[in-house]
């Protein structure tokens, strides 16, 4: 009898009420493996969850989170609010970027400000939690002999930027 059930493919179940005939999964249910004695109820993506993939007879529905939220868990069992710019998502949730780092998106991690001096440039605009520094001309370009329509703003390295 066990052998008969093992012949039932995914999308069906082994129906004990019908001499172990392989019956198709009823609507809104699925079996992802063969030899199942019952079909599982399809997940419904409701409320903060939206449908990413419809349920089929052989696979469960897959959910995503509505705009402004992202999934937690292997099967999107929870929705977590997106972080703000100037924050990053850690194991404990959204945390402000540390001094010297920034994130200009609602996802991803905080990245270090650009080190302008590595490119032989100076800092034109200081960095913030939300924005990278803006590098300007190199200090050599700003020497008295260099032609410039307007006098340069005093440059400061990223490490001295107030938050």
């Amino acid at each position: 009898l066990q052998d008969l059930c093992s012949n039932c493919p995914a999308g069906t179940f082994c129906d004990n009420n019908r001499s172990q005939i392989c019956s198709p999964c009823p609507p809104n249910s699925f079996s992802s493996a063969g030899g199942q004695r019952t079909c599982d109820i399809c997940r419904q993506c409701k409320g903060v969850f939206k449908t990413r993939k419809e349920c089929s007879s052989t696979s469960n529905a897959e959910c995503d989170c509505i705009s402004g939220y992202h999934c937690l868990g292997a099967e999107c069992s929870m929705c977590e609010q997106d972080c703000k710019q100037g924050q990053e998502l850690t194991k404990k949730g959204c945390k402000d970027c540390c001094f010297g780092t920034f994130n200009d998106q609602k996802r991803g991690i905080c990245r270090p400000w650009t080190n302008c001096s590595l490119d032989g440039k100076s800092v034109l605009v200081n960095g913030t939690k939300e924005r990278d520094v803006v590098c300007g001309p190199s200090p050599a370009d700003l020497s008295p002999g260099a032609s410039s329509a307007t006098p340069p703003a005093p440059a400061r390295e990223p490490g001295h930027s107030p938050q």
Partner: antibody, heavy 116, light 107 residues
Framework: QVQLQQSGAELVRPGASVTLSCKAS????????MHWIKQTPVHGLGWIGA????????DYNQKFKDKALLTADKSSNTAYMELRSLTSEDSAVYYC?????????WGTGTTVTVSS | DIQMTQTTSSLSASLGDRVTISCRAS??????LNWYQQKPDGTVKLLIY???RLHSGVPSRFSGSGSGTDYSLTISNLEQEDIATYFC?????????FGGGTKLEIR
């Protein structure tokens, strides 16, 4: 900010019905399922069921299937729970709560006392 | 249904103590575990979701850990305002189920 304001305490007779309300503010009501929780000193917290205000679709704990009826009115941002055929076992505090896979905001709670 | 067990129903501690409250599920809940605080006036607040994520506005002295069937909530430096009852809750499967609660008191 997100808030759930529940209706006031109820004293009801055995066999009667009562409808509790939960008014949401500070967020898009239709975008989140609303769940209802029962709390008693003996049994602690018990999940009653949930309603999707967008569609009116519901899920119930089998234990409460014949006891509770969940509805929602999108126009007033309010969820309702009717409790029927009340007995002393239904005396409890009832909470509504918003769902994200976890309950991030809870209502103020409504105390229901069933007594003759 | 998944059973959630908090074996310690009440706990006495001193201000400044490190307190750990445990919770066990009757089957693997794959980190789908949340913690709530209920104050004596009945107000309920989310503390931690998905095992270890701190809800916004919750002090960093609260932390959560665990996996599989065993989970815990830790308060690293107990304050007077932490006097409350703490509940765990699983979101792995319907019906959602809660632990019986652990009441925290000051020694």
């Amino acid at each position: 900010q997100v808030q759930l304001q529940q209706s006031g305490a109820e004293l009801v007779r055995p066999g009667a019905s009562v409808t509790l309300s939960c008014k949401a503010s500070g967020y898009t009501f239709a975008g989140f399922e609303m769940h209802w929780i029962k709390q008693t000193p003996v049994h602690g917290l018990g999940w009653i069921g949930a309603i999707d205000p967008k569609t009116g679709g519901t899920d119930y704990n089998q234990k409460f299937k014949d006891k509770a009826l969940l509805t929602a009115d999108k126009s007033s941002n309010t969820a309702y729970m009717e409790l029927r055929s009340l007995t002393s076992e239904d005396s409890a505090v009832y909470y509504c709560t918003r769902d994200l896979g976890y309950f991030d905001v809870w209502g103020t709670g409504t105390t229901v006392t069933v007594s003759s | 249904d998944i059973q959630m067990t908090q074996t310690t129903s009440s706990l006495s501690a001193s201000l400044g103590d490190r307190v750990t409250i445990s919770c066990r599920a009757s089957q693997d809940i794959r980190s789908n575990l949340n913690w709530y605080q209920q104050k004596p006036d009945g107000t309920v607040k989310l503390l931690i979701y998905y095992t270890s994520r701190l809800h916004s506005g919750v002090p960093s002295r609260f932390s959560g850990s665990g996996s599989g069937t065993d989970y815990s909530l830790t308060i690293s430096n107990l304050e007077q305002e932490d006097i409350a009852t703490y509940f765990c809750q699983q979101s792995e499967k319907l019906p959602r189920t809660f632990g019986g609660g652990t009441k925290l008191e000051i020694r």
